[in-house]
């Protein structure tokens, strides 16, 4: 049967993003409509047809455009994605003979981790703090020269859609740690990044 091929995309916040749909059919459509999927009913964003060209709905006027003007292959581009743009989008190809054939492409917005790593001595112990803020939520791990060192982790969700994960390494005999390297590892979207800290006696 006739189908539409799509691909989900993950793009960084405040960058452009494109979603593409391809009608796997011998014939082009009469009109292509892009809609955003919403809880109640989909919201029309933009249409393209030979008769009327590109027609963008007012709410999307400065946000998107159709960057591939095709009736078999259609691409919409968001100029500068925000968290509100995250979600799933439907492309509807209104075809002669077979009606509306739809596909769904989903857009996920990510924010690269911002990491801070610092340490603080007290009289009898050393606290090393690693904090990573990202979207989706990052994970924080420690690589230390010896085992048995305790750590505690706190997760905080922010209104802007990012999540902070803060892990504190509690070292009871700080003298042994002086001059040694501690590595905070941040895992985000399948990539692990090492942040190194050498403890100096303050």
């Amino acid at each position: 049967q006739v189908q539409v091929v799509t691909q989900d995309e993950r793009e960084q916040l405040y960058t452009p993003a494109s979603l593409k749909c391809s009608l796997q059919n011998a014939q082009e459509a009469l009109i292509v409509t892009w809609q955003k999927k919403k809880a109640v009913s989909p919201e029309n964003m933009v249409t393209f047809s030979e008769n009327h060209g590109v027609v963008i709905q007012p709410a999307y006027k400065d946000k998107i455009n159709i960057t591939q003007l095709g009736l078999q292959n259609s691409t919409i581009t968001f100029w500068n994605i925000t968290l509100e743009d995250e979600g799933c989008y439907m492309c509807l190809f209104n075809t002669f003979g077979f009606g509306k054939i739809s596909g769904t492409a989903c857009l996920t917005v990510y924010v690269q981790p911002i990491v801070s790593l610092h340490y603080k001595f007290s009289e009898d112990h050393l606290n090393i703090t690693c904090s990573a803020t990202a979207r989706p939520a990052p994970m924080v791990f420690w690589k230390v020269p010896r085992s048995g060192i305790e750590n505690s982790t706190v997760t905080l969700s922010h209104p802007n859609g990012t999540t902070s994960v803060t892990s504190i390494l509690h070292i009871k005999d700080p003298k042994n740690q002086v001059g040694k390297e501690v590595i905070c590892q941040v895992l985000h979207l399948g990539t692990v990044t090492d942040f190194k800290q050498t403890v100096n006696k303050g």
Epitope: V2, A26, Q27, L30, N51, F96
Partner: antibody, heavy 117, light 107 residues
Framework: QVQLVQSGAEVKKPGASVKVSCKAS????????ILWVRQAPGQRLEWMGH????????NYNLKFKGRVTITRDTSASTAYMELSSLRSEDTAVYYC??????????WGQGTLVTVSS | DIQMTQSPSSLYASVGDRVTITCKAS??????LSWFQQKPGKAPKSLIY???RLVDGVPSRFSGSGSGTDFTLTISSLQPEDFATYYC?????????FGQGTKLEIK
Amino acid sequence: QVQLVQSGAEVKKPGASVKVSCKASGYSFTDYIILWVRQAPGQRLEWMGHIDPYYGSSNYNLKFKGRVTITRDTSASTAYMELSSLRSEDTAVYYCGRSKRDYFDYWGQGTLVTVSS
Amino acid sequence: DIQMTQSPSSLYASVGDRVTITCKASQDINSYLSWFQQKPGKAPKSLIYRANRLVDGVPSRFSGSGSGTDFTLTISSLQPEDFATYYCLQYDEFPYTFGQGTKLEIK
């Protein structure tokens, strides 16, 4: 040059089936939809259904309640329309045509199907 | 199903006349309408598609207009070969349906 050549006239008894062929030549068969319409004596044209030869996807007028089947043989560049459980009101001229989207340009010569006991 | 109603059902005119045939849909069909000409014993011939686009090879005296529910086929100056039956077809919604036809005859 483009041609759609239909099979010859048929006389059938009520309850029987008829299969009309439409042989295409002069173009790439899978690039165009093949459609079937019919016209009973003194009546308006009636859309029966169509097929996209590329995928073999077809769509039928539900008025025919499953009595119509449209198929194609891409190797023979031929489309077929089969109508079963024939009744007298199916007596009509059956036409195949081709379309690129909604652009209809070539038609077969028509096939008269007479249903009579 | 969408009903297509043509008017008039028959029309008498002379060579050189300007003729208008209308087609009304029972619901909005956007611009998804074609016009066909048919002569006795012959297959239909496509004249106009998408309400106002002329099919290649069709004389420019034929024109189409309208959108939504009301459509018009105009022949600006009738020629002898134009006497035939004309049908509209909607293809906005399946099943696609034809009008009942307008028979154009010599006055």
